[in-house]
Amino acid sequence: CKAMHVAQPAVVLASSRGIASFVCEYASPGKATEVRVTVLRQADSQVTEVCAATYMMGNELTFLDDSICTGTSSGNQVNLTIQGLRAMDTGLYICKVELMYPPPYYLGIGNGTQIYVIDPEPCPDSDF
């Protein structure tokens, strides 16, 4: 099978505002013009799709309007940002890349990025 290598960081810590960013890089065997990127979350052996986008090489990634993901592409790199994360969203986020066109079709799946999310402490009431 034509498996494509996909690299992503092992660990990322979300910001205090619940935003996590990481780079997903793929070793393209061909001259792809259309690429599909999917972010999967694995927790407790359950895998769910977080978001997905198809983009033309050289163009921006377009996620659905209500998506928690945004991203930009540069060559064979995709910069992904996931927003609105809370502590319960901590888990392994896997980058899946598909070269959709022209044929042949290629699929690559990264090893996953463990995203840690820590809910911010509530601000204490202040007496003045």
Partner: antibody
Framework: EVQLLESGGGLVQPGGSLRLSCAAS????????MSWIRQAPGKGLEWVSG????????DFADSVKGRFTISRDNSKNTLYLQMNSLRAEDTAMYYC???????????????WGQGTLVTVSS | QSVLTQPPSASGTPGQRVTISCSGS????????VYWYQQLPGTAPKLLIY???NRPSGVPDRFSGSKSGTSASLAISGLRSEDEADYYC????????????FGGGTKLTVL
């Protein structure tokens, strides 16, 4: 049942136009790239054009470039081939085919329609 | 003229093993998978082999494919009369304007 059904072929004069359609059923059409392939009478298969699953990318054989356009309507599960400035050498059976994939495997053109005959003659 | 080269004809008797060759170059077969299609008389082509040697479900194991360098071959063992058809090889080509390339086809006759 996974199926492709072509229509729109017929007899047309040189210089004329035709629009072929390919109706897909039994699978998620918007997930697959598609191709048109033709076969002149008594001859072999010739790839004509291809289009990505979103419709954003297209390719054409040199023999039809500038004369044919490929498009798709994913809401109607239909693939199209607009053929302009037709020539006698475009006479052929035209097939649409799905570019299949499963898991890590590219499966080539795994589903074909029955074809529609285009005859260009005066 | 086709990008991939196949013999125009091949023949065999029932029960025999026949092989059909397909020759290409480094930009197609040399760097991509090969696919084989069977076209019975008066019908549309049907996928026979994908990814050099894989059979879709429903294709008998009498059909097998292989690839070496810039050439590929389709072997049919235990030849049957219903195998009489045209066989086409196909690959992808990174050097051409169109990504899909076919062989010229081989007419298999069962004697």
């Amino acid at each position: 049942e996974v199926q492709l059904l072509e229509s729109g072929g017929g007899l047309v004069q040189p210089g004329g136009s035709l629009r072929l359609s390919c109706a897909a059923s039994g699978f998620t059409f918007k997930a697959y790239s598609m191709s048109w392939i033709r076969q002149a009478p008594g001859k072999g298969l010739e790839w004509v054009s291809g289009i990505s699953n979103t419709g954003g990318s297209t390719d054409f054989a040199d023999s039809v470039k500038g004369r044919f356009t490929i498009s798709r309507d994913n809401s109607k599960n239909t693939l199209y081939l607009q053929m302009n400035s037709l020539r006698a050498e475009d006479t052929a059976m035209y097939y649409c085919a799905r570019l299949g994939y499963s898991g890590y495997d590219d499966r080539g053109m795994d589903v074909w329609g029955q074809g529609t005959l285009v005859t260009v003659s005066s | 003229q086709s990008v991939l080269t196949q013999p125009p004809s091949a023949s065999g008797t029932p029960g025999q093993r026949v092989t059909i060759s397909c020759s290409g170059s480094s930009s197609n077969i040399g760097s991509n998978y090969v696919y084989w299609y069977q076209q019975l008389p008066g019908t549309a082509p049907k996928l026979l082999i994908y990814g050099n040697s894989n059979r879709p479900s429903g294709v008998p194991d009498r059909f097998s494919g292989s690839k070496s360098g810039t050439s590929a071959s389709l072997a049919i063992s235990g030849l049957r009369s219903e195998d009489e058809a045209d066989y086409y090889c196909q690959s992808y080509d990174s050097s051409l304007s169109g990504p899909v390339v076919f062989g010229g086809g081989t007419k298999l006759t069962v004697l």
